[in-house]
C-alpha cells in the first residue's frame, strides 16, 4: 500500500494545475490517443514560458486555493500510529539517482536562499520550480545529461545489488520475471518520485540546520 489513504492530497503548484488543464484539453481533443509524456511536458513547458502573468494568474489562484485547502486539512489530520517512520531501507542499497531538476536545485538553491533569507523551504522550492520552468530547454541539457548518466549507473548498480542479494533468482522462470518486470518498473518510478521529494526535503532541512549553526 502507499501510505495513509486518509492523508490529505498534497498541494499543487500553479504549473501543476496548468499541466493538468493541458492534459484535460488534450484528452477532450484526442480521447483515444496515447500521450508521449516527455513530448507533452516539453510542449507544456514551452507554452508556460510564453504565457503572460495575467494568463498564469488563474493557475496561481488555483494553487493558492489548493494550498489553503491542504493546510486546512493537515490541521485536522492525525497520522496513524507507527506509520510516522519511513519504511526500512537497506543502507547498503545504491542511492536513487537525482533528477535533472534536483541537480539544478543543488546549483541554484544557495543563491535563492542567500538572496531571500526569510523564505520558507516551500517558497525556496517554489522559486526553484519557477526558475526551472523558465529555463531554456538548452540550458537544462547539462542537468538532463548528468541525470541520465547517474540513472544508467544506478540501474547497473541496483541490478548488481539485487543479484547479490538473491543468488538463486537467476534459476527461476524468465517468462514470469519478464511479466512482472513492467509492473515493478512502474512501481519503482512512483517510488523514485516519492524518494526524490523526501530527499529534497531532507536536504533543505539539513541546510536549514546548517544555517542555524552559522
Amino acid at each position: 500500500g502507499k501510505g495513509d489513504p486518509k492523508k490529505p492530497r498534497g498541494k499543487m503548484s500553479s504549473y501543476a494545475f496548468f499541466v493538468q488543464t493541458c492534459r484535460e484539453e488534450h484528452k477532450k481533443k484526442h480521447p483515444d490517443a496515447s500521450v508521449n509524456f516527455s513530448e507533452f511536458s516539453k510542449k507544456c513547458s514551452e507554452r508556460w514560458k510564453t504565457m503572460s502573468a495575467k494568463e498564469k494568474g488563474k493557475f496561481e489562484d488555483m494553487a493558492k486555493a489548493d494550498k489553503a485547502r491542504y493546510e486546512r486539512e493537515m490541521k485536522t489530520y492525525i497520522p496513524p500510529k507507527g506509520e510516522t517512520k519511513k519504511k526500512f531501507k537497506d543502507p547498503n542499497a545504491p542511492k536513487r539517482p537525482p533528477s535533472a531538476f534536483f541537480l539544478f536545485c543543488s546549483e541554484y538553491r544557495p543563491k535563492i536562499k542567500g538572496e531571500h533569507p526569510g523564505l520558507s523551504i516551500g517558497d525556496v522550492a517554489k522559486k526553484l520550480g519557477e526558475m526551472w520552468n523558465n529555463t531554456a530547454a538548452d540550458d537544462k541539457q547539462p542537468y538532463e545529461k548528468k541525470a541520465a548518466k547517474l540513472k544508467e549507473k544506478y540501474e547497473k548498480d541496483i541490478a548488481a545489488y539485487r543479484a547479490k542479494g538473491k543468488p538463486d533468482a537467476a534459476k527461476k522462470g524468465v517468462v514470469k520475471a519478464e511479466k512482472s518486470k513492467k509492473k515493478k518498473e512502474e512501481e519503482e518510478d512512483e517510488e523514485d518520485e516519492e524518494d526524490e521529494e523526501e530527499e529534497e526535503d531532507e536536504e533543505d532541512e539539513e541546510e536549514e540546520e546548517d544555517d542555524d549553526d552559522e
Partner: antibody, heavy 123, light 107 residues
C-alpha cells in the same frame, strides 16, 4: 562595488598555451554562473565558455572545444580559462562575464563584465 | 547555431533623435533576447534583458520589444553618451550568439 578583473593575457606563439584569470569582488561569486566572451580586433562579440556555480557543469563554443578549459575556485573568488593549442584566430580581447540566470523572465544575461585582457597569437 | 542579424549595421543620428535598431533571429527564441551597449575600448554593458526588461541603472529612454524572431531596441531621445555600438544576443540556446552590432554615430 561589483567588479571582475581579468589577467594573464599576452603574446603567445601558435600552438602555445596561456591561462587567463578573473578575480571577482563585491558579490557572492559561488552563487553565479560565469562565462568567457571574446572579441577579435574590430569584430563583434563571441561567447567562448560557461561554468555553473559549483563548477560541476561546463559548456564550450565549438571553435574552442577540446582546446580550452574553463574552471573556477570559489574559495578564491576566481574564474580561469586554460587555453592550449592556440591559433591565430584566437587573437582577441577576452572578457570574463557574470551570467545572471533569470528567475522569472527566463533566459540568462551577461550582467557584469570585466575590462578584458588581450591575447595575441602570432609567430 | 542560431544566427542573429542586426539592422542597420550603422546609422547617423543627432542628439534628441528617436533611434530604432532591429534584430532578427534565424529561429524563434521566444523572449530570450538581451541588448548590450559597447563604447570603444570598453567592456559591453547590459541594457535590456528578456527582450523588454530594463536592467537596473539603465536610463528609461532605452526600451526593448518583440518576441519570437523579431526584436527592437529603441532610444527615445538620443543623448551624447549614447553614441556607441549596440549588440543583441540570444540566450535561448548554446552557443550564445550575438548580432554583428549596430554602430550609432553622430550626424
Amino acid at each position: 562595488e561589483v567588479q571582475l578583473l581579468e589577467s594573464g593575457g599576452g603574446l603567445v606563439q601558435p600552438g602555445g598555451s596561456l591561462r587567463l584569470s578573473c578575480a571577482a569582488s563585491g558579490f557572492t561569486f559561488s552563487w553565479y554562473d560565469m562565462s568567457w566572451v571574446r572579441q577579435a580586433p574590430g569584430k563583434g562579440l563571441e561567447w567562448v565558455s560557461r561554468i555553473s556555480p559549483s563548477g560541476g557543469y561546463t559548456m564550450y563554443a565549438d571553435s574552442v572545444k577540446g582546446r580550452f578549459t574553463i574552471s573556477r575556485d570559489n574559495s578564491k573568488n576566481t574564474l580561469y580559462l586554460q587555453m592550449n593549442s592556440l591559433r591565430a584566430e584566437d587573437t582577441a580581447v577576452y572578457y570574463c562575464a557574470r551570467l545572471e540566470v533569470g528567475a522569472t523572465s527566463g533566459g540568462t544575461a551577461f550582467d557584469i563584465w570585466g575590462q578584458g585582457t588581450m591575447v595575441t597569437v602570432s609567430s | 547555431d542560431i544566427q542573429m542579424t542586426q539592422s542597420p549595421s550603422s546609422l547617423s543620428a543627432s542628439v534628441g533623435d528617436r533611434v530604432t535598431i532591429t534584430c532578427r533571429a534565424s529561429q524563434s527564441i521566444s523572449s530570450y533576447l538581451n541588448w548590450y551597449q559597447q563604447k570603444p575600448g570598453k567592456a559591453p554593458k547590459l541594457l535590456i534583458y528578456a527582450a523588454s526588461s530594463l536592467q537596473s541603472g539603465v536610463p528609461s529612454r532605452f526600451s526593448g520589444s518583440g518576441s519570437g524572431t523579431d526584436f527592437t531596441l529603441t532610444i527615445s531621445s538620443l543623448q551624447p553618451e549614447d553614441f556607441a555600438t549596440y549588440y543583441c544576443q540570444q540566450s535561448y540556446s548554446t552557443p550564445r550568439t550575438f548580432g554583428q552590432g549596430t554602430k550609432v554615430e553622430i550626424k
